[in-house]
Interface confidence: low
């Protein structure tokens, strides 16, 4: 009689993460008597996946009724596959004894797992930057398999070209990660802008994943100042206004100085928002001209978002 052969007909099986993998194994003879075991990997470090005789293998079920005496099909199904399950699986026939001894192994079936990439996470710079500066954004996605993946960057729907992408590891692995860094030049109109990282992978069936970052968290638009003298409201009184325009974010403190001495400090509160997302604010100072014998230098000093103060001055003429 011909010697028993262990046949694993599938050299490789590819399964999507979360699905079940069927690993086929048949033997050509009922002799010698003894159980079948499934292992992942070969050699002394191999991992037991299923033992026909004993043990608890909650994710493994036999495809046919392996308890039947004449059964020669020892195919198994492994449920809820994850990338960690990738590897080569061997169906091994043992000869009954005390203990059972390994008799013959199948050629092995390589299980590859198609795993979806995680949602891309986009992160921007730690500190805010001003228009005309170039800032870097990073995008990361993990846990996908196979390695082939494509990543694109967009700013407000326009594709970016200045970026570098790495897929790790370079060699074979159960799953992979992608890391990309894009450079974006800020403009004054970017408060409402978005940077999008788009990842396409075979497991996504043409529906890419996107991660976004709002440039409102990255940009600082410094204000422009204008100090003007308003018509006299009452005799001996002059109204001076400081218009603070086009700034972002809102955090702003204004100080009035009369001839270098602090007159009043206030924090921007009732601001008006421009279409581009920046803010405008106006502060006024009522100056009693009769209290001054000489000309008065009025300075509007603004500290925006913790940055060094900027100021604008106005000389108030005091007529004799």
């Amino acid at each position: 009689e011909e010697e028993l052969q262990v046949i694993q007909p599938d050299k490789s099986v590819s399964v999507a993460a979360g699905e079940s993998a069927i690993l086929h194994c048949t033997v050509t003879s009922l002799i010698p008597v003894g159980p079948i075991q499934w292992f992942r990997g070969a050699g002394p470090a191999r991992e037991l996946i299923y033992n026909q005789k004993e043990g608890h293998f909650p994710r493994v079920t036999t495809v046919s009724e392996s308890t039947k005496r004449e059964n020669m099909d020892f195919s198994i199904s492994i449920s809820n596959i994850t990338p960690a399950d990738a590897g080569t699986y061997y169906c091994v026939k043992f000869r009954k004894g005390s203990p059972d001894t390994e008799f013959k192994s199948g050629a092995g079936t390589e299980l590859s797992v198609r795993a979806k990439p995680s949602a891309p996470v986009v992160s921007g710079p730690a500190a805010r930057a001003t228009p005309q500066h170039t800032v870097s954004f990073t995008c990361e996605s993990h846990g996908f398999s196979p390695r082939d993946i494509t990543l694109k960057w967009f700013k407000n729907g326009n594709e970016l070209s200045d970026f570098q992408t790495n897929v790790d590891p370079v060699g074979e692995s159960v799953s992979y990660s992608i890391h990309s860094t894009a450079k974006v030049v800020l403009t004054r109109e970017d408060v409402h802008s978005q940077v999008i990282c788009e990842v396409a992978h075979v497991t996504l069936q043409g529906d890419p994943l996107r991660g976004t970052a709002n440039l409102s968290e990255t940009i600082r638009v410094p204000p422009t100042l204008e100090v003007t003298q308003q018509p006299v409201r009452a005799e001996n009184q002059v109204n001076v206004t400081c218009q603070v325009r086009k700034f972002y974010p809102q955090r702003l403190q204004l100080t009035w100085l009369e001839n270098g001495n602090v007159s009043r400090t206030e924090t921007a509160s009732t601001v008006t928002e421009n279409k581009d997302g920046t803010y405008n604010w106006m502060s006024w100072l009522l100056v009693n001209v009769s209290a001054h014998r000489d000309d008065v230098k009025l300075t509007c000093q603004v500290e925006h978002d913790g940055q060094p103060a900027v100021s604008k001055s106005h000389d108030l003429k005091v007529s004799a």
């Epitope: 390589e110 196979p146 897929v167």
Partner: antibody
């Protein structure tokens, strides 16, 4: 050692069929694009079709679309080109080749910078009455 | 479809000559351009991948470069075994599923 061996070529009449095989060894075809490229006598190289068997990707040149079918049997580690409705202009040496990405990536075009690194010796298909 | 226009279609050169072959893409393309050498009755052999990377085992006299849509193969000092036909190739989609070849350049002995 990586090797590709084509077989199945021969003389066939116009309108006839032929199936070419590309037996791979030294690597698992599940993880690579396998391409068929042909070369008519005295002419240049013409790309025909490609398959990525793990996910059932198949692509064809316009000149063979609807007539040729590319496939792969991962258990045999073999790719196939089924050629139907053959014409005289299909006469050529047919090569199979492996496409490899070396891990380089072109960010602007979103393209892996790969190439056909291993080729078979070719099999001659002659379509003539 | 992207076309790869290769020039010249043939050239005559002597041993020791510097030889330059150009491929022009019909539109802006990625750097997924490769160069192959083919001798009569033999399969093509990969020389250059990713426009400028030298494939392992290929002599350093072969080099590739890119300028916009122009891709160039240069043989710095032609050797007797270099007389052959050379092809450029572009991998069109992001995983290299579609491929186009140039028409080929035959390098002959002067």
């Amino acid at each position: 050692e990586v090797q590709l061996v084509e077989s199945g070529g021969g003389l066939v009449q116009p309108g006839g069929s032929l199936r070419l095989s590309c037996a791979a060894s030294g690597f698992n075809i599940s993880y690579y694009f396998i391409h068929w490229v042909r070369q008519a006598p005295g002419k240049g190289l013409e790309w025909v079709a490609s398959v990525y068997s793990s996910f059932g990707y198949t692509y064809y040149a316009d000149s063979v679309k609807g007539r040729f079918t590319i496939s792969a049997d991962t258990s045999k580690n073999t790719a196939y080109l089924q050629m139907n409705s053959l014409r005289a202009e299909d006469t050529a040496v047919y090569y199979c080749a492996r496409f490899t990405f070396p891990g380089l990536f072109d960010g602007f075009f979103g393209a892996y910078l790969g190439s056909l690194d291993y080729w078979g010796q070719g099999t001659l298909v002659t379509v003539s009455s | 479809d992207i076309q790869m226009t290769q020039s010249p279609s043939s050239l005559s050169a002597s041993v020791g000559d510097r030889v330059t072959i150009t491929c022009r893409a019909s539109q802006s393309v990625s750097s997924a351009v490769a160069w192959y050498q083919q001798k009569p009755g033999k399969a093509p052999k990969l020389l250059i991948y990713s426009a400028s990377s030298l494939y392992s085992g290929v002599p350093s006299r072969f080099s590739g470069s890119r300028s916009g849509t122009d891709f160039t193969l240069t043989i710095s000092s032609l050797q007797p075994e270099d007389f052959a036909t050379y092809y450029c190739q572009q991998a069109v989609n992001w995983v290299g599923a579609l491929v186009t070849f140039g028409q080929g350049t035959k390098v002959e002995i002067k």
